[in-house]
């Protein structure tokens, strides 16, 4: 799957992670920091 960085107007989309754009899926996707999960990395787990 091809990926690019999200545009700057997506700042804030991923709450605890990096936003990437999946070209083939036309998808806003969050690559979460360690310890976080959820579509927008909104959940913390121990």
């Amino acid at each position: 799957v091809s990926i690019t960085k999200c545009s700057s107007d997506m700042n804030g989309y991923c709450l605890h992670g990096q936003c990437i754009y999946l070209v083939d899926m036309s998808q806003n996707y969050c690559r979460c920091e360690v310890g976080y999960t959820g579509v927008r990395c909104e959940h913390f787990f121990l």
Epitope: V1, S2, S7, S26, Q27, N28, Y29
Partner: antibody, heavy 115, light 107 residues
Framework: QVQLQQPGAELVKPGASVKLSCKAS????????MHWVKQRPGQGLEWIGE????????NYNEKFKSKATLTVDKSSSTAYMQLSSLTSEDSAVYYC????????WGQGTLVTVSA | DIQMTQSPSSLSASLGERVSLTCRAS??????LSWLQQKPDGTIKRLIY???TLDSGVPKRFSGSRSGSDYSLTISSLESEDFADYYC?????????FGGGTKLEIK
């Protein structure tokens, strides 16, 4: 399961406008850009444009920039396309679609422009 | 705009036959191409993305390949539900553009 619900048909008068809806369910609405595609009777597919439901960002086919306006309502997970100054050339089926794995398409709205 | 020239525009074939459809891109699209199937009732689904990756739930008799600026969709052994219209779509640049379509009919 993912669903994109579109009304079946719209009959509109020449010169008028129409706002087509596409209600999404079964997935996170803000995660996938919504595309709109036109198909004239017996013809092929034409890409109109796409909208990012998270922030309303759009990309249009230049050909449709003065014809179509894409918007979303995040609270109801609904995408809209307004078509203006309608002529017989705008009579077509209009589809909304997301490119999620498996791809999902609405059933299409048939727009008929007739006096 | 990138033009996608699709051939043939129509094709008659028999059950069990192997068929190939081709799209040629007027500019480099770097494999950003998908193949779509439209049934007579208007239902559309994507079969292939990234030129050769099979989409979720698509039978393995479908395959996609690339040779330079030519992209092909091959159906290894036609089944009755495969008779439909097929379109290629490039998503390398804006505007996204479709090929003119291929109508696959039963012989």
């Amino acid at each position: 399961q993912v669903q994109l619900q579109q009304p079946g048909a719209e009959l509109v008068k020449p010169g008028a406008s129409v706002k087509l809806s596409c209600k999404a369910s079964g997935y996170t609405f803000t995660s996938y850009w919504m595309h709109w595609v036109k198909q004239r009777p017996g013809q092929g597919l034409e890409w109109i444009g796409e909208i990012n439901p998270y922030n309303g960002g759009t990309n249009y086919n230049e050909k449709f920039k003065s014809k179509a306006t894409l918007t979303v309502d995040k609270s109801s997970s609904t995408a809209y396309m307004q078509l203006s100054s309608l002529t017989s050339e705008d009579s077509a089926v209009y589809y909304c679609t997301i490119w999620k794995l498996g791809t999902y398409w609405g059933q299409g709205t048939l727009v008929t422009v007739s006096a | 705009d990138i033009q996608m020239t699709q051939s043939p525009s129509s094709l008659s074939a028999s059950l069990g036959e192997r068929v190939s459809l081709t799209c040629r891109a007027s500019q480099e699209i770097s494999g950003y191409l998908s193949w779509l199937q439209q049934k007579p009732d208007g239902t559309i689904k994507r079969l292939i993305y990234a030129a050769s990756t099979l989409d979720s739930g698509v039978p393995k008799r479908f395959s996609g390949s690339r040779s330079g600026s030519d992209y092909s969709l091959t159906i290894s052994s036609l089944e009755s539900e495969d008779f439909a219209d097929y379109y290629c779509l490039q998503y390398a640049s804006y505007p996204r553009t479709f090929g003119g379509g291929t109508k696959l009919e039963i012989k």
